[in-house]
């Protein structure tokens, strides 16, 4: 059954003589493996023998003996779906029909495939958008029916017989659907490539010339123009007469309409290539283009500017910048429209001519208060001088200026008093909208620029003020000079450095931390008893009898100054110390008879020792000592001894008489 | 070689049309632009207008764009120029021409003569 | 159009002598993707097409003889005879082919 046998190959196969050509092809035959191959050249079916005659380019056997002449025709197959072919060299008596006999066991098939060799290597084919437009890209492609592995080649683009320098992107087809060369180049095309010829150029792997294909590009693209003007530089004066010629150096397709722009606005009928402007005015001047149109669009000419000469007109200035701040840069600029420029300037400031001011430009790098006025100026050019203008303000702001703080009370103010203060200056501008004060508190403003203190404290002692626009301008401070009485008054040891022992020399200070005016006096007080009226209170030997609470004035002229009540403590050895019986120094046997050790010290007796008539030492140690109950034996005459920190002290003897108990006495 | 031959020569009335040929040979016809140029006695050469046979895209001199009709016929490689409403000014030799990159190609030329 | 002007409208030397023509372009005929000028210079016999002489502005059509030289570029251009030929005698007209076609009014050369 032939219709077992699906082969897939290109229809045609194109090549030129000495090249090769290789053919891309597969087969299927469903009963088995092939077993046979011949390729026939021009194969004809003989009836009579019921085999194919014509040339036998290719034969393959069971045996597998290829001829050897037939190495020029390779059967790059195989068995069951590989049937590519080459033939390397082609001549150009190979063109033509290629036969495949095909044999499988039981089956047979004939595949018939066209070749086509050319004597010479045939061109390419440019392939073009079917339009160009400029700046559009665009991708040339240039095709050829030919690719073998054999046989290398190169596809070049020319420009006007120059390489191009975009680079191109070479592809190659060698499938059962299609055998090619392609090269494509993307590129945008500018209005001036209209016309030039392009060139796909096939070279071999040397690069040596074999064919080529040319086309000519059709841009297409806006018209481009020319402006022509009488006169050449586009300069003349008021009354004069002007023309502009607009040229079409190319346009693709063709134009359409034209038309005359000035500044970018199109000037009413004014439709032709010529453009006159008869006795020009000024304010002809301006940048002129025509512009021309087809069906890709617009083209506009470069601009021609044109320039209507005329003396200055009346000037005007600008300042920058006001108001001014004082010390700040301020530039003028003189404004007057002119054509040429002015060449000259001249400056007035408050009508009064500024010598040596010829510029456009007038700069005051530090502006001064005296600055502030009005600025005029005049223009003048090869036409003449123009007139002078309105002119402009300069307003110059500064701080306020010899800002004072004044007191306004008589003096001496005093501690408690009410202080009023105001806030002085000369100049401002702008005007003072605010006052502040230093330091800050809880004072009343009455009205602007006066401050009130109730109440001043002592320790208020510098004000300052500042008056206040666009900034802040502060007065020196001024002393509010408060007068007070002596603060802080205290009673300090100097002398000695530790605790105070009796019979030590003991120094007093009466200190105080200020005092306005600074003349004081100074008293000395114990329990309302003058004592001194020095700085300081001194005690050669101090004595216990010294000790207690002392008080120290200090006075001025406003007031006087009590410390705080000082206690003199006196450090002394246990004194005056006796030996004190209860209920008395006679006391009957069997009662409780206890013996006190009465001392002066300071500090306090922190210890006691008890010593009967022989000096023995008694085992107590507290200041009482308790006999109970009393013997007859314990009658003798007692002492003590206390001591503190400082020292000792000893009692005289203390006799304790116990006598006989009436029982006592009864049992005698 | 590249060759560009002309019809022969025209007699034509005032109002009448012509057209002319050029038939081209020796290179790929649909490669290059045609022009045609004509020369008025005595006058400069006058660019007319081409066409480029590859698409038949036109472009005309303004001169002439509404009275010449450029046409191309790709399998007879031959060009056409047809000129209406003659006038006696239209009296020239008319030539077809094309460019190559480094050289130009001329026909011999038609001679057109309007007259009464 | 590009505007071609040619300058002298014609000129009469002796033979031997040197002659140049000029053509101004009111535009540059420079394209600027191979740096030439689209400018070429032909000479023209009564009753003969126009015969190629320069291209590219200064390049010579093989087969001219070189006493024929061109040069200029942008809008000015000039052709050079150096020794003139009685055979040279013609119009001589430049055609710029930048953008479309356009050609110069011609000079006229003749011998004294």
């Known amino acids: 059954d032939s219709s077992k046998w699906v082969f897939e190959h290109p229809e045609t196969l194109y090549a030129w003589e000495g090249a090769c050509v290789w053919i891309p092809c597969t087969y299927r035959a469903l009963d088995g493996d092939l077993e046979s191959f011949i390729l026939f050249h021009n194969p004809e079916y003989n009836k009579n023998t019921s085999k194919f005659d014509g040339t036998r380019l290719y034969e393959s056997t069971k045996d597998g003996k290829v001829p050897s002449e037939q190495k020029r025709v390779q059967f790059l197959g195989d068995k069951n779906k590989n049937c590519t072919l080459s033939i390397h060299p082609v001549h150009l008596n190979d063109s033509g029909q290629l036969g495949l006999r095909m044999e499988s066991k039981t089956e047979k098939w004939m595949e018939r495939i066209h070749l086509n060799v050319s004597e010479r290597p045939f061109p390419p084919h440019i392939q073009l958008p079917p339009e160009i437009q400029e700046s559009q890209e665009v991708t040339l492609t240039c095709l050829l029916n030919f690719s073998c592995y054999g046989y290398p080649i190169q596809l070049q683009w020319l420009l006007e017989g120059v390489p191009m320098r975009q680079a191109a992107v070479t592809s190659t087809s060698l499938t059962i659907k299609s055998v090619f060369t392609r090269s494509e180049l993307k590129f945008s095309p500018q209005w001036s490539h209209h016309g030039k010829i392009v060139t796909c150029q096939l070279q071999d792997a040397d690069g040596k010339f074999l064919s080529n294909d040319t086309v000519q590009l059709n841009v297409k693209h806006t018209p481009k123009l020319e402006i022509k003007v009488t006169p050449s530089d586009a300069i003349v004066r008021e009354g004069d007469s002007v023309t502009m010629t607009c040229e079409v150096s190319s346009s693709n397709p063709e134009y359409t309409t034209v038309s005359w722009l000035k500044d970018g606005t199109s000037l009413k009928k004014q439709n032709t290539f010529t453009l006159n402007l008869r006795e020009v005015t000024k304010d002809q001047s301006g940048k002129y283009c025509c512009q021309v149109s087809n069906d890709v669009g617009p083209g506009r000419s470069e601009e021609v500017f044109l320039q209507v000469q005329y003396a200055p007109e009346p000037s005007t200035v600008q300042i920058l910048h006001s108001p001014a701040v004082e010390g700040s840069q301020v530039e003028f600029l003189c404004m007057s429209l002119a054509n040429p420029l002015p060449t000259n300037y001249t400056w007035y400031h408050n009508g009064k001519e500024m010598q040596g001011r010829t510029e456009e430009k007038v700069h005051i790098p530090k502006i001064l208060p005296w600055h502030a006025g009005t600025y005029s100026c005049v223009a003048e050019n090869i036409l003449g001088t123009g007139q002078r203008g309105p002119g402009a303000e300069l307003d110059v702001q500064y701080p306020p200026k010899k800002v004072t703080t004044v007191i306004q009370n008589p003096m001496p103010i005093r501690e408690g008093d009410t202080v009023t203060l105001s806030c002085n200056y000369n100049s401002s501008n702008p005007s003072v909208t605010r006052y502040e004060w230093k330091p800050h508190g809880a004072w009343e403003e009455p009205s602007l620029g006066v401050l009130k203190i109730q109440n001043v404290g002592w320790d208020n002692t510098t004000i300052a003020c500042a008056a206040c626009n666009s900034w802040c301008s502060w007065a020196s401070p001024v002393a509010l000079n408060v007068q007070y009485a002596p603060r802080d008054v205290r009673v300090r040891k100097i002398k000695p450095l530790s605790e105070i022992h009796s019979g030590n020399s003991v120094s007093l200070q009466c200190d105080f931390s200020s005092s306005h005016p600074k003349e004081v006096q100074f008293f000395w007080e114990k329990n309302g008893r003058l004592l001194g009226k020095e700085s300081q209170l001194n005690f050669d030997s101090i004595s216990p009898e010294d000790a207690g609470s002392y008080s120290c004035w200090v006075n001025n002229s406003i007031g006087q100054t009590a410390s705080k009540a000082w206690t003199l403590e006196v450090l002394y050895a246990p004194r005056r110390l006796r030996v004190s019986m209860s209920p008395g120094d006679q006391v009957m046997e069997g009662k409780s008879a206890t013996l006190t050790c009465e001392s002066d010290a300071n500090p306090p007796v922190s210890h006691y020792t008890w010593f009967d008539w022989n000096n023995q030492s008694l085992p107590y140690h507290s200041q009482k000592l308790r006999l109970e109950p009393v013997k007859v034996q314990h009658s003798g005459a007692y002492w003590c001894q206390g001591t503190n920190s400082v020292g000792k002290g000893r009692s005289p003897l203390s006799t304790l008489t116990v006598y006989y108990s009436p029982e006592t006495i009864g049992r005698r | 070689q590249v060759q560009l031959v002309q019809s022969g020569a025209e007699v034509k009335k005032p109002g009448a049309s012509v057209k002319m040929s050029c038939k081209a040979s020796g290179y790929t016809f649909t490669s290059y632009w045609l022009h045609w140029v004509r020369q008025a006695p005595g006058q400069r050469l006058e660019w007319m207008g081409y066409i480029n046979p590859r698409n038949d895209y036109t472009e005309y001199n303004q001169n002439f764009k509404d009275r010449a009709t450029i046409t191309a016929d790709t399998s007879a490689s031959t060009a056409y120029m047809e000129l209406s409403s003659l006038r006696s000014e239209d009296t020239a030799v008319y030539y077809c021409?094309?460019?190559?990159?480094?050289?130009?190609?001329w026909g011999q030329g038609t001679t057109l003569t309007v007259s009464s | 159009d590009i505007v071609l002007t040619q300058s002298p409208d014609s000129l009469a030397v002796s033979a031997g002598e040197r002659v140049t023509m000029n053509c101004k372009s009111s535009q540059s005929v420079l394209y600027s993707a191979n740096h030439k000028n689209y400018l070429a210079w032909y000479q023209q016999k009564p009753g003969q097409p126009p015969k190629l002489l320069i291209y590219w502005a200064s390049t010579r059509e093989s087969g001219v003889p070189d006493r024929f030289s061109g040069s200029g570029s942008g809008t000015d251009f000039t052709l050079t005879i150096s020794s003139v030929q009685a055979e040279d005698v013609a119009i001589y007209y430049c055609?710029?082919?930048?953008?479309?076609?356009?050609f110069g009014g011609g000079t006229k050369l003749e011998i004294k």
């Open positions: 055609h710029q082919y930048l953008s479309s076609w356009t």
């Open positions: 021409a094309r460019r190559d990159i480094t050289t130009f190609y």
